[in-house]
């Protein structure tokens, strides 16, 4: 049999070998496709199937606009002028070239030694699904699961049957000061079809700088709270990626999961003390915040700390 590749929406003509070019003709076309459950023999007189597969006067079969459901096998059996039976067999596959792939949400720059999302490559409207590949400085990037990570997603449109592909690239650049160029290409995997390429993106790789200072914010302001109240400590740090934050009370680490926020609900005197946070950056080691003091006092023991307000939002009078 012969393999035929047809573009979705385009007409396709399959010739019936051996068939006389004009009637009278003895021929039979049958098909087994996504529109049939078994073999369907087409009526030479034509009929409801003519909209998808019609026998032409010369014996050829016309598919006016091939679709995904037309993939399958087409066979013609004809008797030639000398009375010999001639068979034709076609295996039809269809394809659709998507729009040019695009890199969406591209990074503005990369940081050395840490994972960075480069961007997401998107291709819409392909059939069959095809594949997306990433390139670094013109060379194919092979994901290794460590320094180069690719997260892929394929979706099929419920009505058209066409595919949308998404590929998210994350890399860990080894050193700063370089300017790598990333691009993405889509390939249908069909012979004689060149891949479609995105516009390349060139990114600067910077060395990870030390965090620009670390601040410990306390709520209520001043760190003075009545028994049963709530204290919120927030470790504010401007570093990318966000570091792990641990907490220290009176010089001893608190056995808590890393978090930039420490919540002390229903405080009692046992919660009094000096608190600080420690930010651990992958490439810069730990950095500790200035400490803050938490005091638990009955309302009225002392006036409110300077700048603090009562619950009503007004200063309280002893």
């Amino acid at each position: 049999g012969q393999n035929i590749t047809a573009r979705i929406g385009e007409p396709l003509v399959l010739s019936c070998k051996g068939a006389p070019k004009k009637p009278p003709q003895q021929l039979e076309w049958k098909l087994n496709t996504g529109r049939t459950e078994a073999w369907k023999v087409l009526s030479p007189q034509g009929g409801p199937w003519d909209s998808v597969a019609r026998i032409l006067p010369n014996g050829s079969l016309l598919l006016p606009a091939t679709g995904i459901v037309d993939e399958g096998t087409f066979r013609c059996r004809a008797t030639n002028r000398r009375g010999k039976e001639v068979k034709s067999n076609y295996r039809v596959r269809v394809y659709q070239i998507p729009g040019k792939p695009e890199i969406v949400d591209p990074a503005s720059e990369l940081t050395a030694s840490v994972p960075n999302k480069v961007g997401t490559c998107v291709s819409e409207g392909s059939y069959p699904a095809g594949t997306l590949s990433w390139h670094l400085d013109g060379k194919l990037l092979i994901p290794d699961g460590k320094e180069t990570l690719v997260k892929e997603e394929t979706r099929r449109h419920p009505e058209t049957g066409l595919f949308t592909l998404r590929s998210e690239l994350t890399v860990i650049p080894t050193q700063g000061g370089t300017h790598p160029t990333f691009s993405c290409s889509f390939s249908l995997g069909l012979p004689r079809r060149r891949p479609l390429n995105t516009a390349p993106i060139q990114l600067r790789v910077r060395e990870p700088g030390p965090p620009e200072g670390i601040q410990l914010l306390v709520e209520p302001e001043g760190g003075i709270v009545a028994p049963g109240g709530t204290v919120t400590l927030t470790c504010a740090i401007s570093a990318q990626p966000p570091p792990q934050v641990h907490w220290i009370k009176d010089g001893a680490p608190l056995p808590l999961a890393p978090s930039p926020v420490l919540l002390l609900p229903e405080v009692g005197h046992e919660d009094e003390g000096t608190y600080s946070c420690v930010a651990t950056h992958p490439s810069h080691g730990p950095q500790e915040s200035p400490p803050v003091s938490i005091r638990v006092t009955e309302t009225g023991d002392e006036g409110p700390a300077e700048g603090s307000v009562g619950e009503s939002g007004l200063g309280t009078l002893a």
Epitope: R35, T36, E37, A38, K40, S43, Q45, G46, G47, P48, W49, D50, S51, V52, R54
Partner: antibody, heavy 119, light 107 residues
Framework: EVQLVESGGGLVQPGSSLRLSCAAS????????MTWVRQAPGKGLEWVAS????????YYPDSVKDRFTISRDNAKNSLYLQMNSLRAEDTAVYYC????????????WGQGTLVTVSS | DIQMTQSPSSLSASVGDRVTITCRAS??????VNWFQQKPGKAPRRLIY???NLADGVPSRFSGSRSGTDFTLTISSLQPEDFATYYC?????????FGGGTKVEIK
Amino acid sequence: EVQLVESGGGLVQPGSSLRLSCAASGFTFNNYWMTWVRQAPGKGLEWVASIDNSGDNTYYPDSVKDRFTISRDNAKNSLYLQMNSLRAEDTAVYYCARGGDITTGLDYWGQGTLVTVSS
Amino acid sequence: DIQMTQSPSSLSASVGDRVTITCRASQDVGIYVNWFQQKPGKAPRRLIYRATNLADGVPSRFSGSRSGTDFTLTISSLQPEDFATYYCLEFDEHPLTFGGGTKVEIK
């Protein structure tokens, strides 16, 4: 909203001719095959004619072949049925319907127009 | 030509009943069968397309099934507005052929 409106029915004598029209709206007319179906008083439905979306190919059952001609004007979104040599057994309500091929079957129908053939 | 033998030709049922109508094709027509509902003086309305698919705006109490050349329309719980005549249609071959119809009447 898909709409099909038939016109042209009436009382005619056996042997005479009549032309039915169907005005289509609410869809891309030239994307669809179109079909005429009839229903004799108190009887079931009977296929009369179909035409492909371009108008190049027409299809009829033996009962009307050579007497009826289906045609269309895609520029006017209109379907026609020219009925010649009318017989008493052609008396029926004639419906215009969208489709007629395997991709659609028959999905939307007009309200019909009555053709009475009687002397 | 293909024959579509529809049964029963009429039936009496009560509101809430489950109703089943069958069409048998004289040869293989694949999935290319529609079901229609027709009320007196009105045009047919498509209920089911390609044997098993519910048409837009049709209540889910209607369903279509197929076993080889046997096609079935089921109304799971008959409603007052469902009393009408029902037809099947094969559109796999010309001539397009309708079943003879089933009139569903109030018991």
